[in-house]
Interface confidence: low
């Protein structure tokens, strides 16, 4: 099956790669605008300039194009957590991230949220914090994971999932319950 | 033990109104940031709002920035969002949690409160 292709791309498809059809006369091929520019007006003729015109602050491009206004600069989302890693130019949008010893949890495609990483006491690093990923502890004997935290046995009640972990703790205290009852 | 009960949710027409509530215990409220997500059919969790412990800061995801409100009671142990203008998009099962901030988005939820936004 054929991909069904929008107007603008059936249109673009008949130029050859970096050119496009000209609105109003479709026997006219328009050299795009590079990245960092866009398009002021249509070329006036075959072989002539297309009128590009760069972009205004807080806007940009980042590729060949023939939009009538560049695209608005992202802002980095403060209460998300994110700083910004490099401003936006003409030709790149804001590049958005988290702090040294974070990790970006994504809400959605484009909404991240910036968290610590977790530091594994009580235990040891099993997989190190990444980019899009907190860090992976193993909590050492005595101790259960609870919100990625290793957290001591002695506080693990029984209808919780930790007492699998702490076995043997549990069993412990029971039996110290248990002494000298029916 | 830490609860959290939403309520509040139902079946609304478009650009109809809803507030939800959910009452909290089992931990000291008034120490938390609290937040909404939402669940629409089919799809993953979208964050929707969050509030600072002490309401002085409130921030909305684009998509209802304008339309709801996140507020909050402490005397009461109560977080509230209220809803205006509701889309069919806005069609989800909304989840009340507590919003730590340490190491994962949030550590406790509520069994969520479906809303319908359907003609």
């Known amino acids: 099956l054929v991909p069904h292709l929008g107007d603008r791309e059936k249109r673009d498809s008949v130029c050859p790669q970096g050119k496009y059809i000209h609105p109003q006369n479709n026997s006219i091929c328009c050299t795009k605008c590079h990245k960092g520019t866009y398009l002021y007006n249509d070329c006036p003729g075959p072989g002539q300039d297309t009128d590009c015109r760069e972009c205004e602050s807080g806007s940009f491009t980042a590729s060949e194009n023939h939009l009538r206004h560049c695209l608005s600069c992202s802002k980095c989302r403060k209460e998300m957590g994110q700083v910004e890693i490099s401003s936006c130019t003409v030709d790149r949008d804001t590049v958005c991230g988290c702090r040294k010893n974070q990790y970006r949890h994504y809400w959605s495609e484009n909404l991240f949220q910036c968290f610590n990483c977790s530091l594994c006491l009580n235990g040891t690093v099993h997989l190190s914090c990444q980019e899009k990923q907190n860090t992976v502890c193993t909590c050492h004997a005595g101790f259960f994971l609870r919100e990625n935290e290793c957290v001591s046995c002695s506080n693990c009640k029984k209808s919780l999932e930790c007492t699998k972990l702490c076995l043997p703790q549990i069993e412990n205290v029971k039996g110290t319950e248990d002494s000298g009852t029916t | 033990e830490v609860q959290l009960l939403e309520s509040g949710g139902g079946l609304v027409q478009p650009g109809g109104s809803l507030r939800l509530s959910c009452a909290a215990s089992g931990f000291t409220f008034v120490k938390y940031s609290m937040g909404w997500v939402r669940q629409a059919p089919g799809k993953g969790l979208e964050w929707v709002s969050q509030i600072s412990n002490t309401a002085d800061r409130t921030y909305y995801a684009h998509s209802v920035k304008g339309r709801f409100t996140i507020s909050r009671d402490n005397s009461k142990n109560t977080l509230y969002l209220q809803m205006n203008s509701l889309r069919a998009e806005d069609t989800a099962v909304y989840y009340c949690?507590?919003?730590?901030?340490?190491?994962?988005?949030?550590?406790?939820w509520g069994q969520g409160t479906l809303v319908t936004v359907s003609s």
């Open positions: 949690a507590i919003y730590t901030g340490r190491w994962e988005p949030f550590n406790y």
